[in-house]
Amino acid sequence: MAVTACQGLGFVVSLIGIAGIIAATCMDQWSTQDLYNNPVTAVFNYQGLWRSCVRESSGFTECRGYFTLLGLPAMLQAVRALMIVGIVLGAIGLLVSIFALKCIRIGSMEDSAKANMTLTSGIMFIVSGLCAIAGVSVFANMLVTNFWMSTANMYTGMGGMVQTVQTRYTFGAALFVGWVAGGLTLIGGVMMCIACRGLAPEETNYKAVSYHASGHSVAYKPGGFKASTGFGSNTKNKKIYDGGARTEDEVQSYPSKHDYV
């Protein structure tokens, strides 16, 4: 029961986590313009992995996708890749874990197969969570680095002048969503791995019965072996006769030359 609960909870936690990773990846608020020095600005900018948005104080918002792949920083591309890998691994993990759930019966799937699938999905969730956490952390590091490297330069163009404004960007909501989602996916994966141990079929431990011949005139009663097979009326391995047939639990520790195992 505990195994099923652990597996089920792991699945649900991972599902929430992966939904969060997808949400974070699609969100536009990865970096938001820092308004510390200019709190009354009419327009501010926030940017995601895929597009840039501007928002007015009135609430009017406009977003545009980045034009090119080549003009974007390598770090941004790396973050995109990490998040996509996280989503793909998580989605495959979810698919595998659905079939691995103990509460779902699919044909005559053995427990060993379910255990293997649970472990596989668990590992996938762990890697997925790590990818998301890594992606968000790389992006956060990029923001922090850029924040403290504020420089502005000017150059003259055709007829006029273009000034590069070093706008400081700070952590957006997507970063926190990504960190939490990655953590949940990771926790879900660990729970699935723990559940896998409980699902693995253990060796059946039948109680061995040893017979102690106390003398040469021992009369073995018919049906004595019913104790070991577990099919007779005597399924609890109780002593059937006084001749010395005992369950392994009852065997005395001192050796005897008449012991037969």
Epitope: N45, V54, S58, L76
Partner: nanobody, 120 residues
């Protein structure tokens, strides 16, 4: 690169009208605000009017009710309609655009300036 081309300046009599235009070109992702500053001889550059991407406008007190700023979003062009011009409006009018050109790449572009002279 981002380029701004301003036009429409010239000589006009007091009480007359002029229309300045400012066209932005290049790899512009988001055009945040566009507007004009003016600089009279021997004076500092002052804000005339601005318009945001959403159409919110802002005017200097000295031009309120006489000047109107507008924009054509599809052409990335802003217009400054100047009515009831006064001699004190004589200056070089500089068009500017605050733009996002890429990932965490914000720039302010200026044109070379357009001379507006109000004289009888």
């Amino acid at each position: 690169e981002v380029q701004l081309v301003g036009s429409g300046g010239g000589l006009v009599q007091p009480g007359g009208s002029l229309r300045l235009s400012c066209a932005a070109s290049g790899s512009i992702l988001n055009l945040m605000t566009t507007g004009w500053y003016r600089q009279a001889p021997g004076k500092q550059r002052d804000l005339v009017a601005t318009i945001t991407f959403g159409g919110t406008t802002n005017y200097a007190d000295s031009v309120k009710g006489r000047f109107t700023i507008s924009r054509d979003k599809s052409k990335n062009t802003a217009y400054l309609q100047m009515d009831n011009l006064k001699p004190e409006d004589t200056a070089v009018y500089f068009c500017y655009a605050d733009v996002i050109v890429g990932f965490q790449d914000r720039r302010v572009a200026w044109d070379a300036g357009t001379q507006v002279t109000v004289s009888s």
